[in-house]
């Protein structure tokens, strides 16, 4: 730690005195203190001399000596009083700037320690301090206003009693700045705007901040607009509002509008787009395919996006058949507004039944007219299979009918033994029918196909199986010839032979 000579915490001298403060350390040392005139500094290796041969009240202050090379940052200090009967105060600065809730030190230093008992802080022209002003005094440093508030931004004077009369310091202006957390908060209303040519429009750009020092402007396609500004103060915030009123919009008013506000912390901007159209419009679209296929028993949400101006005057979902005249339940229809001009309408179809396949249409109306968007819903079914024995053109034939959607394809299997379903070990022969005959194929219905297997002689200890499958599932039917005739049964059924 450096050592100061004279080795006293405080030194009291008279104006005009010569003052020499010497600091000695292990390495190089540096003096620091309040900036004040008339000092001279001399360095001499590991010592530094701070001196004046004509001390004035302005040299009153605390002088600190540090050793820059000391990792512990040790320092020594001495406080100098230059006791001037005419000048009880040395004011280090005439303006103090702090942020709200910081302590504000008003640096009026007492030039004579004896005067400490009679000091006080006042506002200029002898006005008392504001209520709730919490302050303390240090003869070395001055008056501290604790947790300063914006409202305490005033001009202050330090007062000392000398010979029964109050002697004032020069004034100190305290500026308490509001803590600005960032750039001003912004709103630009509306977020999007559409108007038909000739209609009126309004765009409002507003910014607010805890500090009045901020700028706000509205620009159209990078051109700053000259708009009168309205200012207000509420909820402890300053507000500046720019309102653009357009009585009859035209195409040149369209484009990008940006609301920009800036302060010392930076800049905020937000933008909106203004569209001017020739006439009303109504556009329906869907992100989904308009042709939908869903497995029976499952659910489906049909979604329609609507873009419209002016707003919708009516809308509904309609079932167009072909199975029944039922209409979608209103509780299954849902509307959500994405923004002013875009909406999403959803029809929920849970646990779809066969009778609910068909066409669903969404209709909407605005001053631009009616529009409709139609979905075609086909249900998928796993195949259902049946086999019969018959004679066609005198030949014994197994006839397999398979019904499902999408169209099933058919495979015949011949296997040894009597079984509900042929397994690999039993299979004797396999026939694929690549082109079964389509018996019925109507929109929104199952597709029924028929496959024929001509069998010259039925082997009695064997099973003939028709298998059908599609993307949903598979079905099969086993045919077992019996001496008394023929017996067919679907899989998993108990085979009863009387």
């Amino acid at each position: 730690i450096p050592v100061i000579e004279p080795s006293v915490p405080e030194l009291v001298v008279k104006p005009g005195a010569t003052v020499t403060l010497r600091c000695v350390g292990n390495g190089s040392v540096e003096w620091d203190g309040p900036p004040s005139p008339h000092w001279t500094l001399y360095s001499d290796g590991s010592s530094s001399i701070l001196s004046t041969n004509n001390a004035t009240f302005q040299n009153t202050g605390t002088y600190r000596c540090t050793e820059p090379g000391d990792p512990l940052g040790g320092s020594a200090a001495i406080h100098l009083y230059v006791k001037d009967p005419a000048r009880p105060w040395n004011v280090l600065a005439q303006e103090v700037v702090v942020f709200e809730d910081q302590d504000a030190l008003l640096p009026c230093l007492l030039t004579d320690p004896v005067l400490e008992a009679g000091v006080s802080l006042v506002r200029v022209r002898g006005r008392p301090l504001m209520r709730h002003t919490n302050y303390s005094f240090s003869p070395w440093h001055g008056f501290t206003i604790h947790r300063a508030k914006f409202i305490q931004s005033q001009d202050y004077q330090c007062s000392a009693l000398m010979g029964g009369r109050k002697v004032m310091s020069i004034s100190i202006r305290l500026k308490v700045q509001k803590v600005i957390p960032g750039p001003p908060a912004l709103t630009l209303v509306p977020a999007e705007l559409v108007r038909i040519r000739g209609e009126a429009a309004q765009i409002v750009c507003s910014a607010s901040s805890v500090d009045v020092n901020f700028d706000v402007f509205l620009q159209h396609n990078n051109t700053k607009l000259a708009i009168p500004q309205q200012s207000d103060f509420h909820n402890n915030r300053y507000q500046k509002v720019l309102t653009l009123n357009l009585d009859q919009v035209d195409f040149q008013h369209a484009g990008n509008y940006s609301c920009v506000a800036s302060n010392v912390q930076g800049k905020h901007s937000t933008s909106m787009f203004f569209r001017v159209v020739e006439s009303a419009y109504l556009n329906l679209s869907s992100e989904q395919n308009l042709i939908q296929e869903v497995t029976v028993g499952e659910g489906l949400n049909l979604k329609v996006m609507v873009e419209a101006y002016p707003g919708l005057q009516g809308f509904n979902w309609t079932y167009l058949g072909p199975f029944s005249d039922h209409q979608p339940e209103p509780k299954l229809a849902n509307a959500t507004t994405k923004d002013t001009y875009r909406h999403t309408f959803t029809l929920s179809l849970p646990r779809l039944k066969p009778s609910e396949a068909g066409r669903y249409s969404f209709l909407a109306r605005n001053p631009g007219g009616w529009r409709a968007l139609t979905f075609e819903l086909t249900l998928r079914y796993p195949p259902e299979v049946s086999v019969i024995w018959t004679f066609i053109n005198g030949s014994g034939t197994l006839l397999c009918a398979a019904s499902g959607y999408p169209q099933p394809n058919v495979t015949w299997l011949q296997c040894s033994g009597h079984t509900d379903r042929c397994d690999e070990a039993q299979v004797l022969q396999v026939w694929d029918d690549p082109y079964p005959e389509v018996l019925s194929q109507e929109p929104f219905h199952k597709v029924t196909v028929q496959s024929l297997l001509t069998v010259e002689t039925l082997e009695h200890n064997q099973t003939y199986e028709c298998r059908a499958h599609n993307s949903v599932g598979s079905g099969s039917w086993a045919f077992i010839p019996i001496s008394a005739g023929a017996h067919t049964h679907p899989p998993d059924e108990f085979l009863f032979t009387p």
Partner: antibody
Framework: QVQLQESGPGLVKPSETLSLTCTVS????????WNWIRQPPGKGLEWIGY???????NYNPSLKSRVTISVDTSKNQFSLKLSSVTAADTAVYYC???????????WGQGTMVTVSS | QSVLTQPPSASGTPGQRVTISCSGS????????VNWYQRVPGTAPKLLIY???QRPSGVPDRFSGSKSGTSASLAISGLQSEDEADYYC???????????FGGGTKLTVL
Amino acid sequence: QVQLQESGPGLVKPSETLSLTCTVSGGSISIYYWNWIRQPPGKGLEWIGYIYYIGSTNYNPSLKSRVTISVDTSKNQFSLKLSSVTAADTAVYYCARGRLTYAFDIWGQGTMVTVSS
Amino acid sequence: QSVLTQPPSASGTPGQRVTISCSGSSSNIGSNTVNWYQRVPGTAPKLLIYSNDQRPSGVPDRFSGSKSGTSASLAISGLQSEDEADYYCAAWDDSLNGVVFGGGTKLTVL
């Protein structure tokens, strides 16, 4: 060692407020005093003002009505605000550390501010 | 117009000694200490001399300062090409209550 770095917009419009910040690194702002100095193109240095870490300030009388210098000890930064700027305020702006004999021993590298519409 | 007066230019050949003067008044140089700064083009100013005649560490002893009455001077001996720069004097002014600078002297090494 102590280093100073100025930051702020390089272009300011006439009549607006010029705002600069000086960040002190490698040492504490809570000793010494901290200055702003500028140099207009082709001219000499001009002292703008200083702030002592306690928040007390002293400004060049010719600029006093337009200048505010503030300090944020928690961020180790001090700032300059110069209001109602004109083209005459176009300059390289420096921040510098001051010693008690008014010697500026450490300087930032400077930032050029142009006042133009 | 600067409060402190310096010659706008000075020159010398390598190895020569060059002196730059700074003239003030009783409210600045007459009652306060003088500091000198060197500014090489494109860089920030650097403290060269403080408190009339004190050199900060790292400044070569070729640079020296002096003060007499209301004038001060900066002397550079053994001039080198890297000394080509602008030099400014500065002091506190009691009546203006602020720091004042000289107009600067451009030193050219021939």
